[in-house]
Amino acid sequence: KEEQTTFRDCAEIFKSGLTTSGIYTLTFPNSTEEIKAYCDMDVGGGGWTVIQHREDGSVDFQRTWKEYKEGFGSPLGEYWLGNEFVSQLTGQHRYVLKIQLKDWEGNEAHSLYDHFYLAGEESNYRIHLTGLTGTAGKISSISQPGSDFSTKDSDNDKCICKCSQMLSGGWWFDACGPSNLNGQYYPQKQNTNKFNGIKWYYWKGSGYSLKATTMMIRPADF
């Protein structure tokens, strides 16, 4: 049997026998275009494709539509994988989304959505989520029904303001909504009463900016 040489996600890589967390090359569905991603092969059985990570503020997340579309940062540290890749990937199969959060007091929490996909660019990469479980709040901190993605140069939110400019970062802003994991990074002791920070309302409330976040996806049938 011929070995698979291209992989669409980290679950395929895991199932091929490569079970060490790290950077791997993925291939766009129905294409030869490649993208580098961090694969988490340890959490909850492994096979997770990391689509977002924040940990130290080393990467500027106040980026353009094009940058959020194509991705930016380093998969070994802070990065955004790219809306176009995630949209294409999650449009082909059913994926779950796991969001891991850390606060500055040593606590961790997560939200797990049992179905996640992004619409195409023509629909502003609108987010679709169902089936919330987890410890980071009983109510979804990503507005339901899902919102369009907005950036500093592409305002698609429902607010009379421009949420991306007011709150910083590209996100699925509502008006502006209960979360923004791509907000301004604030260090410890400067992370409260910061309304443009890294927000997950139904875990930490208003004005609390988180220490670290990871968004990762995996096929539902993994």
């Epitope: 607010c159 502006c176 309304f195 139904y202 208003s206």
Partner: nanobody, 133 residues
């Protein structure tokens, strides 16, 4: 330092009235819409009433319409909640909160969305209201 300080809560018999006050300081009061929220024991926090800083528009959750009245005094940086015809189901801790007026929903649904609690940046510590039967 931002402060919202509620007062006026207490124990009242069903059918009675209370007037809650919320004194704001540390931010430009006229740039913020104000809301009243409440949380009963074992229940989620819910929005009660809202007032717009720009034109005084108000909004009430269905269960208090016709009984509660929200108002504000910009000169005193204070928002009020007049509560009449109180019923035991009104028993809760009442909180006032402030959000930037710019964070309003675009279009005709903005008033109905005015009590989205996650848009409120500043919160008071709350005042207990107990309605006995």
């Amino acid at each position: 330092e931002v402060q919202l300080v509620e007062s006026g809560g207490g124990l009242v018999q069903a059918g009675g009235s209370l007037r809650l006050s919320c004194a704001a300081s540390g931010f430009d009061f006229e740039d913020y819409d104000m809301g009243w929220f409440r949380q009963a024991p074992g229940k989620e926090r819910e929005g009660v009433s809202y007032i717009s800083s720009s034109d005084g528009s108000t909004y009430y959750t269905d269960s208090v319409k016709g009984r509660f009245t929200i108002s504000s005094d910009n000169a005193k940086n204070t928002v009020y909640l007049q509560m009449n015809s109180l019923i035991p189901e009104d028993t809760a801790v009442y909180y006032c909160a402030a959000r930037p007026w710019t964070r309003r929903v675009y279009g005709s649904s903005w008033l109905a969305r005015s009590l989205d609690e996650y848009e409120y940046d500043y919160w008071g510590q709350g005042t207990q209201v107990t309605v006995s039967s």
